[in-house]
């Protein structure tokens, strides 16, 4: 879908990954001055969510709120403008926003190979495993947008594991990972404990924690 | 004023499919969601699927699962509805109607049906 | 075998003030979806009558009125006349896997001589 009006920007707060009956605030903004504001989940027939938008200092923008999170509210996620209503003349749609349910299963164990403490240069590998079936491992890291995922291996000493190469070390961080079933791609496990990774003989050593932006005020629509 | 003008009445054989069109004229159609519902004779109403299609989204009801396929042509402001492997028990009046995207299930405007016989 | 059920048939003399009631259940009414209400009079298409709960489009007369409560909703309509002789049928969506949108059994609404 093309659209008249170039596409709106599509944001979690606090993230994308959302615990169990916890909340995420789907914000849509723009530069445009869209009137309404226009969320679907993809997939679904009757997912779609309006909003009318407000505008501020030149952006328009609506906050959805998503929750309590279950299952059925995990998903694909697009947000369109429009400055029209009945009909609508939507914009081309957002970047796609999968919205994840964590908290689901026990979690994983995260370790580290050679140890969580590295040399900087030096190759270190971070290892998910757990004894459930898990068919597939994410690995987050805090202050990045997106997970890295692999499949889990066959079962090796009563465990399914996957193994993370990160390459040679730069700078460290703090590491999460999650297990999902292929035909629940949205519904992940537990948080694993965090992990986290230190880099010496390297002047930038540590990973900052993100700031989260705040949510925005306004009435937000509510899908649940 | 819009109008959703549905393709004329047929006979089918068993085993055999029926496509049925629904054109919207005197308005725009990619803007709202295509749903498809027939009523067999002296019964109710039973919705099959609809289509969404600016989202391209289309959902299909678990009675119909595998057997109907509907779809949208933007270009030519119509949508379809095709039903395979018919039996007698799909002889009914198959009607295509409107919602809002944000209300797909309230059907503000109907096609005027069409009738699909299934006889051998 | 209807998701939502209705009464097969209700009747009244003119002017009079009937009720058609929609039961559905927790996956459906009761989860907080809106009910729609249709009239179809003889040998033509549905025409949405009642949108949203309670809401009339243009051109419907407010001598009818719809509302919800629960897992049920109900149509009444006031100062029955002729020309309301038809079948109503209610609807509403359900998260449940038995489908996406579904209907009541439909409502026979006859108007007494």
């Known amino acids: 879908h093309e659209g008249v009006h170039r596409k709106p920007s599509l944001l979690a707060h606090p993230g994308p990954l959302v615990k169990s009956e916890e909340t995420v605030i789907l914000q849509c903004w723009s530069d445009v001055r869209f009137q309404h504001f226009l969320l679907h989940r993809e997939g679904k027939f009757k997912d779609t969510l309006h909003l009318i938008g407000e505008h501020h200092d030149g952006v328009s923008k609506a906050n959805f709120s998503i929750g309590p999170m279950m299952q059925d509210l995990a998903g694909t996620y697009r947000c369109y403008g429009s400055v029209t209503h009945s009909p609508y003349q939507l914009s081309a749609p957002s970047d796609p926003l999968d919205i994840v349910i964590t908290g689901l299963y026990e979690k994983p164990s995260l370790s580290a190979q050679p140890g969580p403490t590295v040399l900087a240069g030096e190759s270190v590998t971070l290892s998910c495993s757990s004894r459930s079936s898990y068919d597939m491992y994410h690995l987050s890291r805090e202050g990045e947008a997106h997970e890295r995922r692999f499949s889990a291996g066959p079962k090796v000493n009563g465990t399914f594991q996957a193994d993370f190469p990160l390459g040679p070390a730069t700078h460290g961080g703090t590491y999460r990972c999650f297990g999902s079933f292929r035909d629940s791609p949205y519904e992940w496990s537990n948080s694993s404990d965090p992990l986290l990774v230190s880099v010496t003989g390297n002047p930038s050593n540590s990973w900052p924690s993100p700031t989260e932006p705040s949510s925005e005020t306004g009435n937000p629509r509510h899908l649940h | 004023q819009v109008q959703l003008v549905q393709s004329g009445a047929g006979v089918k054989k068993p085993g055999s499919s029926v496509k049925v069109s629904c054109k919207a004229s005197g308005g725009t159609f990619s803007s709202y969601a295509i749903s498809w519902v027939r009523q067999a004779p002296g019964q109710g109403l039973e919705w099959m699927g609809g289509?969404?299609?600016?989202?391209?989204?289309?959902n299909y009801a678990q009675n119909f699962q595998g057997r109907v396929t509907i779809t949208a042509d933007e270009s030519r402001n119509t949508a379809y509805m095709e039903l395979s492997s018919l039996r007698s028990e799909d002889t009914a009046m198959y009607y295509c109607a409107r919602g809002e995207l944000v209300d797909p299930d309230a059907f503000d405007i109907w096609g005027q049906g069409t009738l699909v016989t299934v006889s051998s | 075998q209807s998701v939502l059920t209705q009464p097969p048939s209700v009747s009244g003399a003119p002017g009079q003030r009937v009720t058609i009631s929609c039961t559905g259940s927790s996956s459906n009414i009761g989860a907080g979806y809106d009910v729609h209400w249709y009239q179809q009079l003889p040998g033509t298409a549905p025409k949405l009558l009642i949108y949203g709960n309670s809401n009339r489009p243009s051109g419907v007369p407010d001598r009818f009125s719809g509302s919800k409560s629960g897992t049920s909703a109900s149509l009444a309509i006031t100062g029955l006349q002729a020309e309301d002789e038809a079948d109503y049928y209610c609807?509403?969506?359900?998260?449940?896997?038995?489908?996406?949108?579904?209907f009541g059994g439909g409502t026979k609404v006859t108007v007494l001589a």
């Open positions: 289509i969404i299609p600016i989202f391209g989204t289309s």
């Open positions: 609807q509403s969506y359900d998260s449940s896997l038995s489908g996406y949108v579904v």
